[in-house]
């Protein structure tokens, strides 16, 4: 058989081999596709089926606007002048070249050493779906999960039946003073269809900057609180990637997991001390917090003046 | 909102002609076949002529065939039934409806018009 | 041709009843069947387009099945408004064939 392909909504012609050119001819030909569900024979005279496959008078079918649902295979069958059967068969597929693909939402600049969201390259109304690929300075970025990473996603529309194809590209750039390239391209996978590429998109890559500083929130506000209380330690940082936490207490590291929340619950006078946290980002190295200090006092025990707020923000009462 | 009205039925005697229209709108006319089904007094509804959107292709059953002829003009959302030869069992309501392919059968129906052959 | 053979003629049912009309081919007409229904001095509407699928605007409680040549309209809950005819038709070869009808009066 032969394989034919077809644009969707293109008329299609399909000959009918050894069919004599004029009337009469002895010739039969039936489809099985998306509209039939095992094989139907058209009737020479025409009928209802015209509308989407009608037999020419010179033997051939014309496929006057070809759709996803005509997906499949045409035989003709027909008695050549001289009495011989001859038969032709095709197998037909369809294709949709969507709009030129767009990257929407990109990066103004990227940040080394981190993951970055470059944008998502979009492409609309193709059949069948086809693929997404990203390059980068012209060469194509192969996905390793790691430094590059692509999430894609494939929608089909109910009533059309094309498709929308979503790839969106994070890369941690190895170092700063670059201005790589990235552009996207859509392939529909068919012989003879070049891809389709989108304008590509020039960045800058900067060095991460260092932690614009680091604070120590703590909650209840200065750090006075009663027995059995709870006292929540907040290091908060301006970096990015977050770095690692780390605690120290009276000057010597916690043996705790790295987070940026320390919590005390039901607290007693063995808690009480000077705390700070360490907050250790890959390319500078450590920075500590300024330290609070942690105070266990019994309710009203060098608290402030009866039924009043002090400065440390703990309401006390007589 | 699609729409479909018939006109030109009347009493005609056997042997004569009548020519009936249908006027469409809400639509885009020429992107559909159409069709004509009749219904005799107190009796089912019978196929009578389909036309496809360009005009170029029209079918009908023998009762009718070589009797009737269907056309249209696509400028005007116009369609057409030309009857000669009238019989009295050619009486009945003359529905014009919209498609007649596979890919639709009739979806939207006028309100018919009818045609009374008698002496 | 294809004849559509559609039964019963006519039937008596009360509102709220399961009402089911079918309608057989004489050959294979995959499924290129409407249903339509329609009420005394008016045009018919359609119920179902290719034997299952359910046209716009149409209640629920109308639905289209089909077995090989068999084709079959059910009324899960009868209405005052349903009672009426119904008509099959085969829309795969020409001549184009409709069923002969079936009344649906009340009980």
């Known amino acids: 058989g032969q394989n034919i392909t077809a644009r969707i909504g293109e008329p299609l012609v399909l000959s009918c081999k050894g069919a004599p050119k004029k009337p009469p001819q002895q010739l039969e030909w039936k489809l099985n596709t998306g509209r039939t569900e095992a094989w139907k024979v058209l009737s020479p005279q025409g009928g209802p089926w015209d509308s989407v496959a009608r037999i020419l008078p010179n033997g051939s079918l014309l496929l006057p606007a070809t759709g996803i649902v005509d997906e499949g295979t045409f035989r003709c069958r027909a008695t050549n002048r001289r009495g011989k059967e001859v038969k032709s068969n095709y197998r037909v597929r369809v294709y949709q070249i969507p709009g030129k693909p767009e990257i929407v939402d990109p990066a103004s600049e990227l940040t080394a050493s981190v993951p970055n969201k470059v944008g998502t390259c979009v492409s609309e109304g193709s059949y069948p779906a086809g693929t997404l690929s990203w390059h980068l300075d012209g060469k194509l970025l192969i996905p390793d999960g790691k430094e590059t990473l692509v999430k894609e996603e494939t929608r089909r529309h109910p009533e059309t039946g094309l498709f929308t194809l979503r790839s969106e590209l994070t890369v941690i750039p190895t170092q700063g003073g670059t201005h790589p390239t990235f552009s996207c391209s859509f392939s529909l996978g068919l012989p003879r269809r070049r891809p389709l590429n989108t304008a590509p998109i020039q960045l800058r890559v900067r060095e991460p900057g260092p932690p614009e500083g680091i604070q120590l929130l703590v909650e209840p506000e200065g750090g006075i609180v009663a027995p059995g209380g709870t006292v929540t330690l907040t290091c908060a940082i301006s970096a990015q990637p977050p770095p690692q936490v780390h605690w120290i207490k009276d000057g010597a590291p916690l043996p705790l997991a790295p987070s940026p929340v320390l919590l005390l619950p039901e607290v007693g006078h063995e808690d009480e001390g000077t705390y700070s946290c360490v907050a250790t980002h890959p390319s500078h190295g450590p920075q500590e917090s300024p330290p609070v200090s942690i105070r266990v006092t019994e309710t009203g025990d060098e608290g402030p003046a009866e039924g009043s707020v002090g400065e440390s923000g703990l309401g006390t009462l007589a | 909102e699609v729409q479909l009205v018939e006109s030109g039925g009347e009493l005609v005697q056997p042997g004569g002609s009548l020519r009936l229209s249908c006027a469409a709108s809400g639509f885009t006319f020429n992107n559909y076949w159409m069709t004509w089904v009749r219904q005799a007094p107190g009796k089912g509804l019978e196929w009578v002529a389909s036309?496809?959107?360009?005009?170029?292709?029209?079918y009908y059953p023998d009762s009718v065939k070589d009797r009737f002829t269907i056309s249209r003009d696509n400028a005007k959302n116009s369609l057409y039934l030309q009857m000669n030869s009238l019989r009295a069992e050619d009486t009945a309501v003359y529905y014009c409806a919209r498609g007649g392919d596979i890919t639709t059968g009739f979806d939207y129906w006028g309100q018919g018009t009818l045609v009374t052959v008698s002496s | 041709d294809i004849q559509m053979t559609q039964s019963p003629s006519s039937l008596s049912a009360s509102v709220g009843d399961k009402v089911t009309i079918t309608c057989r081919a004489s050959q294979d007409v995959g499924f290129y069947v409407n249903w339509f229904q329609q009420k005394p001095g008016k045009a018919p509407r359609r119920l179902i387009y290719r034997a299952t699928n359910l046209a716009d605007g149409v209640p629920s409680r109308f639905s289209g099945s089909r077995s090989g040549t068999d084709f079959t309209l059910t009324i899960s809950s009868l209405q005052p408004e349903d009672f009426a005819t119904y008509y099959c038709l085969e829309f795969d070869e020409h001549p184009l064939t409709f069923g002969g009808g079936t009344k649906v009066e009340i009980k």
């Open positions: 036309i496809d959107n360009s005009g170029d292709n029209t």
